[in-house]
């Protein structure tokens, strides 16, 4: 029961996280005009990964896409790439994890296969979350650098009679969405990996074989040995993972020659 809960929760958390990563990637507010000195502005600028927008006090908003690929800063391209990789990995991870869910039965898929798929999706979620966090952090670093550069320009460029207002940009809502979403995806991935340990088959039910020692009538039943997957636990702790009674569908099948390859 605990395994199913952990796996299910991991899936849901990752799903929310990946939805957040997609939302952050599509959002226009990656950087927003700094309003520290002027909290109410007649023209408000904000920028995303794909377009920049201007909202006038009249309520009109105009957005322009970045219709160039080569003319964009390398850092912006890198952030785009990281976010897209994160989304793609996350989407594949979601697809894999759906089939890996313990509560979903697909044909005669065995627990070992589900364990492997859960681990795979978990790793994908972890990498996806890290990509998103990395992408957002790179963009944030870029903003901080540009912020202080433009601040320096504001105070050095006032020698003339006419002031030119330098627009400074600060963290937009998308950055916080991205960080949170990346974190959730990462946590979901870790939960899937933890759930994978409990999904690994508990024991291998080899048929008892009698060994007759000369002169004695003692039969040895090698029932205490398990096929090791690296995530196995002591058979005494079985109930921690399966929650006690099993349904008919959950009865473990006898191993075939294809198991534990």
């Amino acid at each position: 029961m605990a395994v199913t809960a952990c796996q299910g929760l991991g899936f849901v958390v990752s799903l929310i996280g990946i939805a957040g990563i997609i939302a952050a990637t599509c959002m226009d507010q990656w950087s927003t005009q700094d309003l520290y000195n002027n909290p109410v502005t007649a023209v408000f600028n904000y920028q995303g990964l794909w377009r920049s927008c201007v909202r006038e006090s009249s309520g009109f908003t105009e957005c322009r896409g970045y219709f160039t690929l080569l003319g964009l800063p390398a850092m912006l391209q890198a952030v785009r790439a990281l976010m897209i990789v994160g989304i793609v990995l996350g989407a594949i991870g979601l697809l894999v994890s759906i089939f890996a869910l313990k509560c979903i039965r697909i044909g005669s898929m065995e627990d070992s296969a589900k364990a492997n798929m859960t681990l795979t999706s978990g790793i994908m979620f972890i990498v996806s979350g890290l990509c998103a966090i990395a992408g957002v952090s790179v963009f944030a670093n870029m903003l901080v650098t540009n912020f202080w550069m433009s601040t320096a320009n504001m105070y050095t460029g006032m020698g003339g009679m006419v002031q030119t207002v330098q627009t400074r940009y600060t963290f937009g809502a998308a950055l916080f969405v991205g960080w949170v979403a990346g974190g959730l995806t990462l946590i979901g991935g870790v939960m899937m990996c933890i759930a994978c340990r409990g999904l690994a088959p508990e024991e291998t039910n080899y048929k008892a074989v009698s060994y007759h020692a000369s002169g004695h009538s003692v039969a040895y039943k090698p029932g205490g040995f398990k096929a090791s997957t690296g995530f196995g636990s002591n058979t005494k702790n079985k109930k921690i993972y399966d929650g006690g009674a099993r349904t008919e569908d959950e009865v473990q099948s006898y191993p075939s020659k294809h198991d534990y390859v």
Epitope: N38, T41, A42, V43, N45, S52, G59, V165, T167
Partner: antibody, heavy 118, light 113 residues
Framework: EVQLVQSGAEVKKPGASVKVSCKAS????????VGWVRQAPGQGLEWIGN????????NYNQKFKDRATLTVDKSTSTAYMELSSLRSEDTAVYYC???????????WGQGTLVTVSS | DIVMTQSPDSLSVSLGERATINCKSS????????????LTWYQQKPGQPPKLLIY???TKQSGVPDRFSGSGSGTDFTLTISSLQAEDVAVYYC?????????FGQGTKVEIK
């Protein structure tokens, strides 16, 4: 046809308040901000403030912040500008306008003359 | 506050001649986000409310005759009437639409010589 129709001329005593109305028609009232601009006799234009009919959010010229109150009534598509503690220098024609692209005022009311005299 | 200064205060031009009005702002009204200058021009005839002519420094409002044009960037702007007509006699105002408070120039009176 877009129209902004303002209330009639007012004569007020110093220290009193005046409330000018502006009824909008010919467009979706909540889609455009309403601005207020005044013009003293023989003088230039002076911006008082803007109000959003959709959420009653306002932007004021600091000069009028304490004395001017901009409100809207969505049900009647009417904007109001109330100016308190009137002084003789507040004698002017008060215009309501519609705020459009480029933060420009594209349609104007006919104006309301407010005379402050003792 | 951005101070808008127009020149000249009044202008006498013969019919059919070119009229040029200048407007200077104390700060740049160029928005870096969309590279647009938030400067607006209005025409006010005696006894009438102002009429919008040009916004974003050079974009003509619909219905405005082609003889009106706006130019300039940053802090210096110009309104040009390529061929003055009798109906163009009015006071012309420039407006800062870039930052609060919105401010207007003192106006330029255009007359026929």
């Amino acid at each position: 046809e877009v129209q902004l129709v303002q209330s009639g001329a007012e004569v007020k005593k110093p220290g009193a308040s005046v409330k000018v109305s502006c009824k909008a028609s010919g467009y979706t009232f909540t889609s455009f901000w309403v601005g207020w601009v005044r013009q003293a006799p023989g003088q230039g234009l002076e911006w008082i403030g803007n109000v959003s009919p959709s959420d009653s959010y306002t932007n004021y010229n600091q000069k009028f912040k304490d004395r001017a109150t901009l409100t809207v009534d969505k049900s009647t598509s009417t904007a109001y500008m109330e100016l308190s503690s009137l002084r003789s220098e507040d004698t002017a024609v008060y215009y309501c306008t519609r705020l459009s692209s480029g933060n420009s005022f594209d349609y104007w009311g006919q104006g309301t003359l407010v005379t402050v005299s003792s | 506050d951005i101070v808008m200064t127009q020149s000249p205060d009044s202008l006498s031009v013969s019919l059919g001649e070119r009229a040029t009005i200048n407007c200077k702002s104390s700060q740049s009204v160029l928005n870096s986000g969309n590279q647009k200058n938030y400067l607006t021009w209005y025409q006010q005839k005696p006894g009438q409310p102002p009429k919008l002519l040009i916004y974003w420094s050079s974009t003509k409002q619909s219905g405005v005759p082609d003889r009106f044009s706006g130019s300039g960037s940053g802090t210096d702007f110009t309104l040009t009437i390529s061929s003055l007509q009798a109906e163009d006699v009015a006071v012309y105002y420039c407006q800062n639409a870039f930052s609060f408070p919105f401010t207007f120039g003192q106006g330029t009176k255009v007359e026929i010589k």
